[in-house]
């Protein structure tokens, strides 16, 4: 797995570099997770033909994956910093159960899947420090998450491959939209 942000050789070689601001650290963390997703998607696409399936065909699924909508305040029209930040944190918390599901789905990229999961936990902590209105953030119910995980793991092989692909694609899109909005803050 790649070295977590802030621990690479470039950082060691430049001891006089200014410490990263909170926004820079969040930006770097999201890019690190996107790199991890990219590596996981490579393995998924090499293993199955899901990546060739059209978006429309894949949309016909019953997964309730977090997605950005106009009302969330993360797009240019209706942009609202606080509403958007709450949506990003809430969405990441909702993705955690799906990232847990990914843990046993990879052979050669097992460490990478773990790195994506752990880095997301760290990202949530960074973002919670940035948010003023933590009361507005709803945490998913552990019991509901546990039964969802059981249900996903009980699917047949084809559906599990489909689910893996959908989680990676949706998580990537969510992170991209989140980072674009965070860059406006």
């Amino acid at each position: 797995a790649p070295v977590p942000p802030g621990e690479d050789s470039k950082d060691v070689a430049a001891p006089h570099r200014q410490p990263l601001t909170s926004s820079e650290r969040i930006d770097k963390q999201i890019r690190y997770i996107l790199d991890g997703i990219s590596a996981l998607r490579k393995e998924t696409c090499n293993k199955s033909n899901m990546c060739e399936s059209s978006k429309e065909a894949l949309a016909e699924n019953n997964l309730n994956l977090p997605k950005m909508a106009e009302k969330d305040g993360c797009f240019q029209s209706g942009f609202n910093e606080e509403t958007c930040l709450v949506k990003i944190i809430t969405g990441l918390l909702e993705f955690e159960v799906y990232l847990e599901y990914l843990q046993n789905r990879f052979e050669s990229s097992e460490e990478q899947a773990r790195a994506v999961q752990m880095s997301t936990k760290v990202l949530i902590q960074f973002l919670q420090k940035k948010a003023k209105n933590l009361d507005a953030i709803t945490t998913p119910d552990p019991t509901t998450n546990a039964s969802l995980l059981t249900k996903l793991q009980a699917q047949n092989q084809w559906l599990q491959d489909m689910t893996t692909h959908l989680i990676l694609r949706s998580f990537k899109e969510f992170l991209q939209s989140s980072l674009r909005a965070l860059r406006q803050m």
């Epitope: 890019r31 996107l34 797009f75 240019q76 990537k172 899109e173 991209q176 939209s177 980072l179 674009r180 860059r183 406006q184």
Partner: nanobody, 123 residues
Framework: EVQLVESGGGLVQAGGSLQLSCTAS????????MAWFRQAPGQEREFVTD???????WYADSVKGRFTISRDNAKNTVYLQMDSLRPEDTAVYYC?????????????????WGQGTQVTVSS
């Protein structure tokens, strides 16, 4: 890293329209966020607009409602439709690409740049 070539610049009267194109080669174009920046003589290069991998767009306030960014992944091309042009839109327009598919309003977010195309709006 992707190579970018802009085209479509030229001289146009105030109130007129122009469409710029930027064609990419050497990368998976559909996975990049694409942006347009511009630089007027003696000024800093400034953000105009961008379009993310999933199609979300952002515009600078100065061009909102007049300029439209779009992409055609099959042709590896991003377009900038410029309407109701003003003399203050005169600048060299640069195309930029972000391999993370995100974009943003600052130059540091982009890892590939085109050479630029001149747009002159006369009054």
């Amino acid at each position: 890293e992707v190579q970018l070539v802009e085209s479509g610049g030229g001289l146009v009267q105030a109130g007129g329209s122009l469409q710029l194109s930027c064609t990419a080669s050497g990368g998976t174009f559909s996975e990049y966020a694409m942006a347009w920046f511009r630089q007027a003589p003696g000024q800093e290069r400034e953000f105009v607009t961008d379009i993310g991998e999933s199609g979300g767009t952002w515009y600078a306030d100065s061009v909102k409602g007049r300029f439209t960014i779009s992409r055609d992944n099959a042709k590896n091309t991003v377009y900038l439709q410029m309407d109701s042009l003003r003399p203050e839109d005169t600048a060299v327009y640069y195309c930029a690409a972000d391999s993370y598919g995100v974009g943003g309003g600052a130059e540091r977010y982009y890892d590939s740049w085109g050479q630029g195309t001149q747009v002159t709006v006369s009054s």
